[in-house]
């Protein structure tokens, strides 16, 4: 297949191609679909994916997808080595670690082999899309009397995350909920001995390494009170 | 469907600056990617400036650190600052709008808008 791969030099469209509606005088007036949005994740910088909707398609195409960094000794353009299926047709393409790079502009362009005028290059910061593991290892320690504390870990830097930490008792309806920032820690000033309590933890990338919106998943809960073990009332361990 | 209009162009002495406005009507621009292209005489479109509606903006290499792109969606408005205009500079700015499902989605090639101005043009003499 011959396809035009266009070079990161900020100029990554030059010629007048397809327009859906109004365009400048001078365009082509050829109207085609446009090519699905990319939607990139960076996975506790471990991995990234990057996807695409492959059903929006009006027939099954094997999109090709290559990418740069911008303005960086990465700026040569890759080909995707790992493509993603969906019922035998692309739908997205896994970069491993050593291809992402953080702090620089990542440029991914989507384009259809039959079509090679019909492409779309899209720019994205990579700190503002990393989603961290869950927390786990949670732990309780009790204080005193009435007071607990939540511990927790997560397999990456700490200073990069804050938390959000749930709770509730089995006579509540709905979770209170604590912001924490990175010391992933979280106390109870007063605790109702007489009541069992849940707790989970998620964390978001956000804010001193990047701006992502998405949180982790949520840990396994942990529970304590009335209905936990009583061997040892000062520690009690994760409960899946 | 959402309109586009430029403002803002000029004749300006290098080293000048320029603020152009983009205003849309017919449609929010709360979840559309937006983008600055300019053309001068003779040469492509290219790409200028682009941001997403979640926030996040990008440069071409020409104009990084000289031009900032802004919106206010409460004005259903985009803008590009424009300082240090070089002659170079001189060309018809388009501004062009692609809806968009996610927050980080951001163009910077010309094919992936469906709306476009008319343009607006600026001159820097030297």
């Known amino acids: 297949l011959n396809t035009t791969i266009l070079t990161p030099n900020g100029n990554e469209d030059t010629t007048a191609d397809f327009f859906l509606t109004t365009m400048p005088t001078d365009s082509l007036s050829v109207s085609t679909l446009p090519l699905p949005e990319v939607q990139c994740f960076v996975f506790n910088v471990e991995y990234m994916n990057c996807t695409w909707n492959s059903s929006s398609e009006p027939q099954p195409t094997n999109l090709t997808l290559h990418y740069w960094y911008k303005n960086s000794d990465n700026d040569k353009v890759q080909k995707c080595s790992h493509y993603l299926f969906s019922e035998e047709i692309t739908s997205g393409c896994q970069l491993q670690k050593k291809e992402i790079h953080l702090y620089q502009t990542f440029v991914v362009q989507l384009q259809d082999p039959r079509e090679p005028r019909r492409q779309a290059t899209q720019m994205l910061k990579l700190q503002n899309l990393v989603i961290p593991w869950a927390p786990e290892n949670l732990t309780l320690h009790k204080l005193s009397e009435s007071q607990l504390e939540l511990n927790w870990n997560n397999r990456f830097l700490n200073h990069c995350l804050e938390h959000l930490v749930q709770y509730r008792t089995d006579w509540d309806h709905s979770w209170t909920e604590q912001s924490v920032d990175y010391r992933h820690k979280f106390s109870l000033p007063s605790v109702d001995g007489q009541k069992r309590y849940t707790f989970r933890v998620r964390s978001r990338f956000n804010p001193l390494c990047g701006s992502a919106q998405h949180w982790s998943e949520w840990s396994h809960p942990i529970h304590w009170g009335s209905n936990t073990s009583k061997e040892n009332p000062f520690l009690f361990a994760l409960e899946a | 469907q959402v309109q586009l209009q430029e403002s803002g162009g000029g004749l300006v002495q290098a080293g000048g600056s320029l603020r152009l406005s983009c205003a849309a009507s017919?449609?929010?621009?709360?979840?559309?990617?937006m983008g600055w292209f300019r053309q001068a005489p003779g040469k492509e479109r290219e790409f200028v400036a682009a941001?997403?509606?979640?926030?996040?903006?990008f440069y071409a290499d020409s104009v990084e650190g000289r031009f900032t792109f802004s919106r206010d969606n409460a004005k259903n408005a985009v803008y590009l600052q424009m300082n240090s205009l070089q002659p170079e500079d001189t060309a018809v700015y388009f501004c062009a709008g692609a809806p968009a499902s996610f927050a980080t989605t951001a163009y910077s090639s010309s094919n992936s808008y469906s709306y476009w101005g008319q343009g607006t043009q600026v001159t820097v003499s030297s």
């Open positions: 941001d997403s509606w979640g926030g996040d903006t």
């Open positions: 017919g449609r929010t621009l709360s979840r559309v990617a």
